[in-house]
């Protein structure tokens, strides 16, 4: 692979449908602008879940309607995906691109298998 | 003598703490009495979860206080483990022994990683 990107093999979403994992990259240069993309792979289909560009030392900014939030610390990005349902179970791949200054580097992790279990509905309170 | 035993790699317990999986064995002979044991491996510690002996074509009979239930169909055993909590997450290994008639055969599967997520408590109904 190109740039090395590490992420956990398995993560369980909690009963509120929230899953968090760390995506860590080995930076070959002194990037100041980094782009992080989360991709979901299921049945050989890959779809983009969310993406954010951030300046080193600053917060990650996802779009307002994104299901992702995150923070960065050095070469580590702490990603949280919310609103997950059982049908969202799948392999979530972290892609990291060092956008600026040159040179451009990119790398992808092996993916984090996120398991999601739908909660039982609470009994009606009569 | 060794025997091939197959079981799924991963299973999720549902929100009520119930997990089910199939344990299938390649029977080298015409066994009439079979013993199935479920073992849990966590932190290199192996503990017995439950065990049952059954006559081919009959029901599996676990002890009354067992957390396991099961049914058999040919060389397949359908196992259900209940009362699971998040702390019970681990590798559950299926061990099969052909007890009678001789020769004795024994095999163990590679284990099923069972993931358990504790549900959120329902709000109090005032």
């Amino acid at each position: 692979k190109a740039m090395h990107v590490a992420q956990p093999a398995v993560v369980l979403a909690n009963s509120r449908g929230i899953a968090s994992f760390v995506c860590e990259y080995a930076s070959p240069g002194k990037a100041t602008e980094v782009r992080v993309t989360v991709l979901r792979q299921a049945d050989s289909q890959v779809t983009e879940v969310c993406a954010a560009t951030y300046m080193m030392g600053n917060e990650l900014t996802f779009l307002d309607d994104s299901i992702c939030t995150g923070t960065s610390s050095g070469n580590q990005v702490n990603l949280t995906i919310q609103g997950l349902r059982a049908m969202d179970t799948g392999l979530y791949i972290c892609k990291v691109e060092l956008m600026y200054p040159p040179p451009y580097y990119m790398g992808i992790g092996n993916g984090t298998q996120i398991y999601v279990i739908d909660p039982e509905p609470c009994p009606d309170s009569d | 003598k060794a025997m091939h035993v197959a079981q799924p790699a991963v299973v999720l317990a549902n929100s009520r703490g119930i997990a089910s999986f199939v344990c299938e064995y390649a029977s080298p002979g015409k066994a009439t009495e079979v013993r199935v044991t479920v073992l849990r491996q966590a932190d290199s510690q192996v503990t017995e979860v439950c065990a049952a002996t059954y006559m081919m074509g009959n029901e599996l009979t676990f002890l009354d206080d067992s957390i396991c239930t099961g049914t058999s169909s040919g060389n397949q055993v359908n196992l259900t483990i209940q009362g699971l909590r998040a702390m019970d997450t681990g590798l559950y290994i299926c061990k099969v022994e052909l007890m009678y008639p001789p020769p004795y055969y024994m095999g163990i599967g590679n284990g099923t990683q069972i993931y358990v997520i504790d549900p959120e408590p329902c709000p109090d109904s005032d």
Epitope: A2, A26, P28, G29, K30, K95, P103, Y104 | -
Partner: antibody, heavy 115, light 107 residues
Framework: EVKLDETGGGLVQPGRPMKLSCVAS????????MNWVRQSPEKGLEWVAQ??????????HYSDSVKGRFTISRDDSKSSVYLQMNNLRGEDMGIYYC??????WGQGTLVTVSA | DIQMTQSPTSLSASVGETVTITCGTS??????LNWYQRKQGKSPQLLIY???NLADGMSSRFSGSGSGRQYSLKISSLHPDDVATYYC?????????FGGGTKLEIK
């Protein structure tokens, strides 16, 4: 101004060795993974070898066609990268370019393998 | 190894036209694709990196798109200066294979 200057090309007999050198200037050499790419009329552009930088422990990677015959090395203090080519074959002929993470390219040096 | 299938191998277009070159890959390369322009007798020049990003100093008439296993390079409002051979390259993993090239000529 970014510059990459390759030297060391020329005519060589099959089976003989040759060493190419590339000196870089105008960019932070130590931040770049350095590569050799060759161009021939038969094969178009063909990636040959890569040497990564210090954070990647100077890992080296080679195309299958040169593995075991070519060796890439670098000297960050001289902003230089080298390609030692042994047991040269006819199919190794072409223009050899030195490139920094494919962003910057040298003018190339021609390697001709002939008896 | 990742195979790169570039098409067409050559194309001829008039000044002012828009042309598209495509590059297919044998497996998903997650946007790890560069495009290069090589003019006759010159070194290759990086044109597009990471599938969609325009390299410094290159005209905004060039644009890259695509994901997964299908990528394309679009050249809008063709100039005589665009006569060159264009190459795609996998930069996700070694070996960093190139496409066969597309030779662009002006009618």
């Amino acid at each position: 101004e970014v510059k990459l200057d390759e030297t060391g090309g020329g005519l060589v007999q099959p089976g003989r060795p040759m060493k190419l050198s590339c000196v870089a200037s105008g960019f932070t050499f130590s931040d770049y993974w350095m590569n050799w790419v060759r161009q021939s009329p038969e094969k178009g552009l063909e990636w040959v070898a890569q040497i990564r930088n210090k954070p990647y422990n100077y890992e080296t990677h080679y195309s299958d066609s040169v593995k075991g015959r070519f060796t890439i090395s670098r000297d960050d203090s001289k902003s230089s990268v080298y390609l030692q080519m042994n047991n040269l074959r006819g199919e190794d002929m072409g223009i050899y370019y030195c490139t920094g993470t494919f962003a910057y390219w040298g003018q190339g040096t021609l390697v001709t393998v002939s008896a | 190894d990742i195979q790169m299938t570039q098409s067409p191998t050559s194309l001829s277009a008039s000044v002012g036209e828009t042309v598209t070159i495509t590059c297919g890959t044998s497996e998903n390369i997650y946007g790890g694709l560069n495009w290069y322009q090589r003019k006759q007798g010159k070194s290759p020049q990086l044109l597009i990196y990471g599938a969609t990003n325009l390299a410094d100093g290159m005209s905004s008439r060039f644009s890259g798109s695509g994901s997964g296993r299908q990528y394309s390079l679009k050249i809008s409002s063709l100039h005589p200066d665009d006569v060159a051979t264009y190459y795609c390259q996998n930069v996700l993993s070694t070996p960093y294979t190139f496409g066969g090239g597309t030779k662009l000529e002006i009618k």
